[in-house]
């Protein structure tokens, strides 16, 4: 049975086997087409989600679809039901928490009272002044909190206590990519991890350990990517994996936060990378122990210079490394998180591509997660 499962796929009605390599090849080899059912699926970027959270204390903003303007949500008459609606609009199913925060002196958006209409937040028509003088600070999920704060600068062995959202994404029990837990059902990784194998069956996720072989595997229900854009072949290197059964969080299995829509990180901002990738460029061996390293944001202009990536780094990507080189993510770390710590840890980037490993002028290039929030929310909403 093990041999059969490894090399063949069973079609139904009539029952017969086809070679597993015919799964997800674009041809209907089973009469009912089930060989093309459980495959990596693409999902369009979709419409603008009409709510978002700002890095200013996670304050809620609502879109007026008529004018295309964004407004800050006033705390007046804001309820748990409205908080739940806002989070559902972003695709969350967990119980949110919210609080009032004072309107700051730098408040540049108009502040409006919020109401609900057909399960979407709306601005109250006759919205007067914000009497409470407070905005809504909203958290849809308790995320980005680990048991231990990393202290080391440079490259160091990591503990799952520091990075409980890190997962190993495996095909046929072999580590292929890293990934990050975003909520009980969803793992974030890179689309290029699935180029070779587009059938969902043999992909598994392993969570809850810093050692590669030592933790149980979790079945995957769906793998979703964005439609390929031939104009920008390296763009859209992002994928979401939906787990068959929701994770139960613990000390070693917890979600990382998504970035805020306005999370603009300036050059030299400290960031962290983790992974089980190769310890040397062009070979070496995969590390059995999770490794962590501190890096920093590298200016896109510098990254696109003639002695670097010569314009290949787009608006939807970011560069990180250390100016003198030597610290970088490498093969096998693809799909893992590039992380920033404000109050919570946020996944601001996904390990995507680069030339070599750790060169001074060619740092790692990462998918900029904030550029894909809308897509993530639309995928989640479609799957709620």
């Amino acid at each position: 049975k093990v041999i059969l499962d490894k090399y063949y796929f069973l079609c139904g009605q009539p029952l017969h086997f086809i070679p597993r390599k015919q799964l997800c090849d674009g041809e209907l080899d089973c009469p009912l087409g089930e060989d093309e059912e459980h495959c990596v699926k693409s999902f369009p970027e979709g419409p603008a989600v009409a709510v978002r959270l700002s890095k200013d204390r996670s304050t809620l903003q609502v879109l007026d679809s008529a004018t295309g303007n964004w407004f800050s949500a006033c705390f007046d008459n804001f309820t748990e039901a409205l908080a739940e609606t806002a989070c559902r609009q972003m695709g969350y199913s967990s119980k949110p928490t919210f609080r009032a925060v004072e309107i700051g002196p730098d408040q540049d958006l108009d502040v409006v009272e919020i109401t609900e209409n057909s399960q979407e937040l709306r601005m109250r028509n006759s919205s007067g002044p914000c009497l409470s003088g407070s905005l809504v600070s909203l958290h849809c999920l308790a995320c980005g909190k680990s048991l231990k704060t990393p202290r080391v600068v440079g490259v160091e062995e990591a503990s799952v206590d520091s990075w409980p959202w890190q997962v190993s994404i495996q095909y046929d029990k072999q580590h292929v990519c890293g990934g990050s837990i975003l909520d009980p059902h969803w793992v974030l990784t890179a689309a290029h991890c699935f180029r070779k194998h587009t059938d969902v069956f043999n992909w598994k996720v392993r969570a809850g350990s810093d050692k590669l072989g030592s933790f149980p595997s979790l079945a995957v229900a769906k793998i979703i990517i964005i439609e390929f854009n031939p104009m920008y072949p390296k763009d859209n290197d992002i994928a979401l994996m939906k787990l068959q059964f929701p994770l139960t969080f613990s000390g070693t299995v917890r979600p990382i936060c998504l970035p805020f829509f306005d999370e603009e990180l300036t050059p030299a901002t400290p960031l962290w990378i983790i992974g089980w990738g190769f310890t040397k460029q062009n070979g070496g061996k995969m590390s059995d122990i999770l490794l962590q390293a501190s890096v920093q944001v590298i200016d896109s202009t510098r990254c696109n210079a003639d002695d670097a990536y010569q314009g290949e780094v787009t608006e939807k990507m970011m560069c990180a490394g250390i100016p003198e080189g030597g610290v970088d993510t490498c093969q096998g770390d693809s799909g893992g998180p590039l992380m920033y710590q404000s109050d919570q840890w946020h996944v601001v980037g996904i390990v995507s591509w680069g030339y070599g490993c750790g060169g001074p002028s060619t740092p790692g290039v990462y998918t900029k997660v904030s550029a894909y929030l809308n897509w993530i929310y639309n995928v989640w909403k479609a799957e709620l």
Partner: antibody, heavy 119, light 107 residues
Framework: QVQLVQSGAEVKKPGSSVKVSCKAS????????ISWVRQAPGQGLEWMGI????????RYSPSFQGRVTITADESTSTAYMELSSLRSEDTAVYYC????????????WGQGTLVTVSS | EIVMTQSPATLSVSPGERATLSCRAS??????LAWYQQKPGQAPRLLIY???TRATGIPARFSGSGSGTEFTLTISSLQSEDFAVYYC?????????FGQGTKVEIK
């Protein structure tokens, strides 16, 4: 509603061990960590350790490492704290407390169990 | 481990007055700070977590502020049921640690 019900008061001799239980109800037991916190008479609160029933992972305070063992039985939704090599200064009320939502603060507490260590 | 220090040890306040309790961490705990209230013979009760978020069912007269190493719990107008001992707890990293407590008593 969430409830944590602890076992009754204990009197123990120095050098012996005590095992206190904490039965949880009103929520999914494996979904939250259970910590143990103690309070000596007239003193403040002291965290001893935590168990995550989802994977039975435990973490202990260095002050109690080697002397405390926290376990959980998912079938009965019960957590246990065993403290060994008891001395008179372990006389305290021992509380179990539920960790809330992966953020390590305690939203529900047991009623407390008084452990008296006396020869 | 992170040491939490509360001040004052005792605060004497008249009913209806404002009470301000302080808590200092020996190193940054970001916003991972909780406040608990404990009355004699009872288990502690969660008031505030994440430095400023009120727990379910906690009256609006309780508010928390601060981040990093300096935190404050404010009770805007003390009611008779608020006279108790208040503890801060950092929930930023293990081992979790508590302050030694501030007793709020009737003046």
């Amino acid at each position: 509603q969430v409830q944590l019900v602890q076992s009754g008061a204990e009197v123990k001799k120095p050098g012996s061990s005590v095992k206190v239980s904490c039965k949880a109800s009103g929520y999914t037991f494996r979904g939250s960590g259970i910590s143990w916190v103690r309070q000596a008479p007239g003193q403040g609160l002291e965290w001893m350790g935590i168990i995550y029933p989802a994977d039975s992972e435990t973490r202990y305070s260095p002050s109690f490492q080697g002397r405390v063992t926290i376990t959980a039985d998912e079938s009965t939704s019960t957590a246990y704290m065993e403290l060994s090599s008891l001395r008179s200064e372990d006389t305290a009320v021992y509380y179990c407390a539920r960790e809330s939502s992966s953020w390590d603060y305690f939203d529900y507490w047991g009623q407390g169990t008084l452990v008296t260590v006396s020869s | 481990e992170i040491v939490m220090t509360q001040s004052p040890a005792t605060l004497s306040v008249s009913p209806g007055e404002r009470a301000t309790l302080s808590c200092r961490a020996s190193q940054s705990v970001r916003s991972y700070l909780a406040w608990y209230q404990q009355k004699p013979g009872q288990a502690p009760r969660l008031l505030i977590y994440g430095a400023s978020t009120r727990a379910t069912g906690i009256p609006a007269r309780f508010s928390g502020s601060g981040s990093g190493t300096e935190f404050t719990l404010t009770i805007s107008s003390l009611q008779s049921e608020d006279f108790a001992v208040y503890y801060c707890q950092q929930h930023g990293s293990l081992p979790l640690t508590f302050g030694q407590g501030t007793k709020v008593e009737i003046k």
